[in-house]
Amino acid sequence: CKAMHVAQPAVVLASSRGIASFVCEYASPGKATEVRVTVLRQADSQVTEVCAATYMMGNELTFLDDSICTGTSSGNQVNLTIQGLRAMDTGLYICKVELMYPPPYYLGIGNGTQIYVIDPEPCPDSDF
């Protein structure tokens, strides 16, 4: 039996509106019906939680109301979107997947996606 592998893109560039999307794919060792997905941000040696959702296979991901993340799932793939990003949020975003039910529990953690965020230049005042 193999450890659970999680794949995610190495680099993503956020849009000018501060939105970044990436796919997190996991090779499930079992037939999970309940999955927990957490996005972590690693800066220096500090790891913080960005958002987390638990979902039943085939259902939508439900993040907390005040979450900056949204997502959808399809099989062993999760499409994650993080919004409201600023240049200071540039960093490594790690996808963590946990197969919660039925037993046995499995943990898989991706290598991280480096998200680059560039704040848009303010529009110059126009003289009319």
Epitope: C1, A3, T48, A52, T54, K96, P104, Y106, L107, I109
Partner: antibody, heavy 118, light 106 residues
């Protein structure tokens, strides 16, 4: 700084139940799973289970299903483990530990010694 | 269950020596392995996680290596305060620990 403060030593009769507590401070309680680990004198560490304070979900070591009940009180940032139908085999030190976001048990309580004796 | 085997229950060393403690997983756990140090009457303390990452405040004489099924904790220039029990643990599935290796003076 992260701290887990556990309740004091317990001496209980066989067949009884006991409820151990673990009060967390220095971090956001709902973000991290709280684990419980058993250590018998001179022996290794045995994982009992964990609870996710945000939604109360629990993962158990099958061996301890029916033996332990895990709960949390998020208002006081306290985790509890109740052990039922105690026997001498349950005499041990019980640790609570925070599971770090990347998986390891990064901070531990000081342990609660439990003695089951008539 | 994933079984973590620490084949040496005791290891003898001297201050200033280099010592390696080994641990073998019964199946592939990638790098989801941690090492803990426990002194008598104390709780375990995290030393290494992700097989090779030192926890906050751990001296750089502690190094971890390995992936898959074979893992090693190496302490170079052993100090008297390093004499303790060392447990490996996997967290690829629900946590399981090795039985521990007691590091003692020769």
């Amino acid at each position: 700084q992260v701290q887990l403060q556990q309740s004091g030593p317990e001496l209980v009769r066989p067949g009884a139940s006991v409820k151990l507590s673990c009060k967390a401070s220095g971090y956001t309680f709902t973000t991290y799973d709280i684990n419980w680990v058993k250590q018998r004198p001179g022996q290794g560490l045995e994982w009992i289970g964990w609870i996710y304070p945000r939604d109360g979900s629990i993962i158990f070591n099958e061996k301890f299903k029916g033996k332990a009940t895990l709960t949390v009180d998020t208002t006081s940032s306290t985790a509890y483990m109740e052990l039922h139908s105690l026997t001498s085999e349950d005499s041990a030190v019980y640790f609570c530990a925070r599971r770090g976001l990347l998986g390891p048990l990064d901070y531990w309580g000081q342990g609660t010694p439990l003695t089951v004796s008539s | 269950d994933i079984v973590m085997t620490q084949s040496h229950k005791f290891m003898s060393t001297s201050v200033g020596d280099r010592v390696s403690i080994t641990c073998k997983a019964s199946q592939d756990v990638a790098t989801t392995v941690a090492w803990y140090q426990q002194k008598p009457g104390q709780s375990p303390k995290l030393v290494i996680y992700w097989a090779s990452t030192r926890h906050t405040g751990v001296p750089d004489r502690f190094t971890g290596s390995g992936s898959g099924t074979d893992f090693t904790l190496t302490i170079s220039n052993v100090q008297s305060e390093d004499l303790a029990d060392y447990f490996c643990q996997q967290y690829s599935s629900y946590p399981t620990f090795g039985v521990g290796t007691k590091l003692e003076l020769k």
